[in-house]
Interface confidence: low
């Protein structure tokens, strides 16, 4: 009953909402959003001893404070600073894995290679992964009906600003050799408009990051092209090099074999290329 008590005030069924509520183009807040965030926080802090000091009620309060009662097209990074402060976490040098348009494989990889971390392996990323949320100006209600769409409504919405804020922070605190997993099946393997291309690349700190190593993941079994020569990868190399960070690129021709070899590096078939 603890969770229910905490969130009783937040429970509103969609049919109970006032008819004048703002209609946005995007889907509404994920069902049971407050309960989900709190439950994820509790689970995360139980599994990660270094975060056991975190008070999940305070985390939820800070999360809620970032968007509740605020016009959902006017959210700023500053709104999330109290939450960012509570969720401060560091990744050891050489252990940061960024990704772009290939989230599932990146997460499968860090589930096997437990000493590497994506943003979603960190507390704040874990809390918000795959969730949608927004509030409404001057009410304490969560909008479960609709939320702003990044393209059709506005970019300064609660979800987009959250990911921009935590992605910036994640990149800023990375050090050593940073890895990024890119989707070789897409027309733009490196997309300047992605979160990686627009936020993370520009917030890697040359004083702390010696190199960025891109892993280009191939989609087709028979695809033997060197996608590291792709024009968009050359564009990424140029951006990174101008920032005094070395750049390396590797083709991952067989992602299934790649994961298998991460699990069992001694397997004889792993001595050949992947």
């Amino acid at each position: 009953s603890g969770l229910n008590d905490i969130f009783e005030a937040q429970k509103i069924e969609w049919h109970e909402l006032p008819r004048w509520r703002q209609q946005w183009s995007g889907s509404g807040t994920t069902s049971r959003f407050p309960e989900t965030v709190l439950a994820r926080c509790v689970k995360y802090t139980e599994v990660h001893p270094e975060m056991r000091h975190v008070d999940c009620q305070s985390v939820w309060d800070a999360f809620k404070g970032a968007f509740i009662s605020k016009y959902p097209c006017n959210i700023t990074e500053e709104d999330y600073q109290p939450l960012v402060k509570l969720g401060t976490q560091t990744v050891p040098c050489n252990k940061t894995l960024l990704w772009s348009r290939i989230k599932d494989l990146a997460h499968q990889f860090t589930q096997v290679q437990r000493d590497m971390f994506t943003l979603e392996d960190m507390l704040l990323g874990y809390l918000a992964d795959d969730l949608t949320w927004c509030g409404e100006f001057n009410t304490f209600e969560i909008n479960y009906q609709s939320c702003p769409d990044w393209r059709k409504d506005c970019s300064n919405n609660p979800v987009s600003v959250f990911w921009k804020t935590v992605s910036r922070r994640f990149a800023e605190t990375a050090c050593g050799v940073v890895h990024v997993m890119l989707n070789g099946s897409r027309s733009k393997i490196f997309d300047k408009n992605s979160t990686f291309g627009s936020v993370e690349v520009h917030n890697l700190q040359p004083e702390k990051v010696q190199a960025l190593e891109a892993w280009v993941i191939h989609g087709g079994r028979e695809d033997s092209r060197d996608l590291c020569q792709d024009p968009t990868i050359k564009e990424l190399e140029s951006i990174i090099s101008k920032r005094n960070i070395r750049f390396f690129c590797k083709n991952i021709y067989r992602p299934d074999k790649f994961l298998q070899c991460v699990k069992n590096p001694e397997d004889s078939s792993c001595l050949s290329g992947i």
Epitope: A174, Q205, K208
Partner: antibody
Framework: QEQLEESGGDLVKPEGSLTLTCTAS????????ICWVRQAPGKGLEWIAC???????TYYASWAKGRFSISKTSSTTVTLQMTSLTVADTATYFC???????????WGPGTLVTVSS | AQVLTQTPSPVSAAVGGTVTINCQAS????????LAWYQQKPGQPPKLLIY???NLASGVPSRFSASGSGTQFTLTISEVQSDDAATYYC??????????FGGGTEVVVK
């Protein structure tokens, strides 16, 4: 409670040497920049040097190169070695940490270095 | 070498009034916004007020605000309180990488 504390401040003679230590409590230097800043009596703040704990890279103010050396000696300590000290080096020396790179969000109380014959 | 010039100093303000402090950089700061403001009281270390030109640091009252870009930056204290009497410093970060502090502006509250 995250805190920084400087130690090693002393009275030294001109041309003498001194090593200051910055110690973290409540956290360890992992990805932080740890820097030294000094303040002469009645004067403004002056940046000396930074070390990036993750990479070990060091950066110095142009005037500090050669006489000052910053190093990370453990996960919670950073030192500043100062040589060929002059009267102009008399100041309170602060260590400060930056969890990004461009601003100092945590400061120690400072340690006084007096250079006098 | 990069120079940060703060004006005016000292500056006097009445309780409840507004104070504006300017900081001019001899060359553009990194990313046009890598500039911070600090408050320092006698016998104490500096305290971060503003980072990245306009972002309020954690726990700092909203009476403090700042703006600017490139080489020109401003710190504003509205509804000045006696506790705001202190010296204020701007600090710029350059990609060299070097850091420079302004000379400081003393705020006297009457």
């Amino acid at each position: 409670q995250e805190q920084l504390e400087e130690s090693g401040g002393d009275l030294v003679k001109p041309e003498g040497s001194l090593t200051l230590t910055c110690t973290a409590s409540g956290f360890s230097f992992s990805n932080d920049a740890i820097c030294w800043v000094r303040q002469a009596p009645g004067k403004g703040l002056e940046w000396i040097a930074c070390i990036y704990a993750g990479s070990g890279n060091t950066y110095y103010a142009s005037w500090a190169k050669g006489r000052f050396s910053i190093s990370k000696t453990s996960s919670t300590t950073v030192t500043l070695q100062m040589t060929s000290l002059t009267v102009a080096d008399t100041a309170t020396y602060f260590c400060a940490s930056a969890d990004t790179i461009d601003y100092f969000n945590l400061w120690g109380p400072g340690t006084l270095v007096t250079v006098s014959s | 070498a990069q120079v940060l010039t703060q004006t005016p100093s000292p500056v006097s303000a009445a309780v409840g009034g507004t104070v504006t402090i300017n900081c001019q950089a001899s060359q553009s700061v990194y990313n046009n916004n890598y500039l911070a403001w600090y408050q320092q009281k006698p016998g104490q270390p500096p305290k971060l007020l503003i980072y990245r030109a306009s972002n309020l640091a954690s726990g700092v009252p909203s009476r403090f605000s700042a703006s600017g870009s490139g080489t020109q930056f401003t710190l504003t204290i509205s509804e000045v309180q006696s506790d705001d009497a202190a010296t204020y410093y701007c600090q710029a970060y350059y990609r060299d990488p070097t850091t420079a502090f302004g000379g400081g502006t003393e705020v006297v509250v009457k």
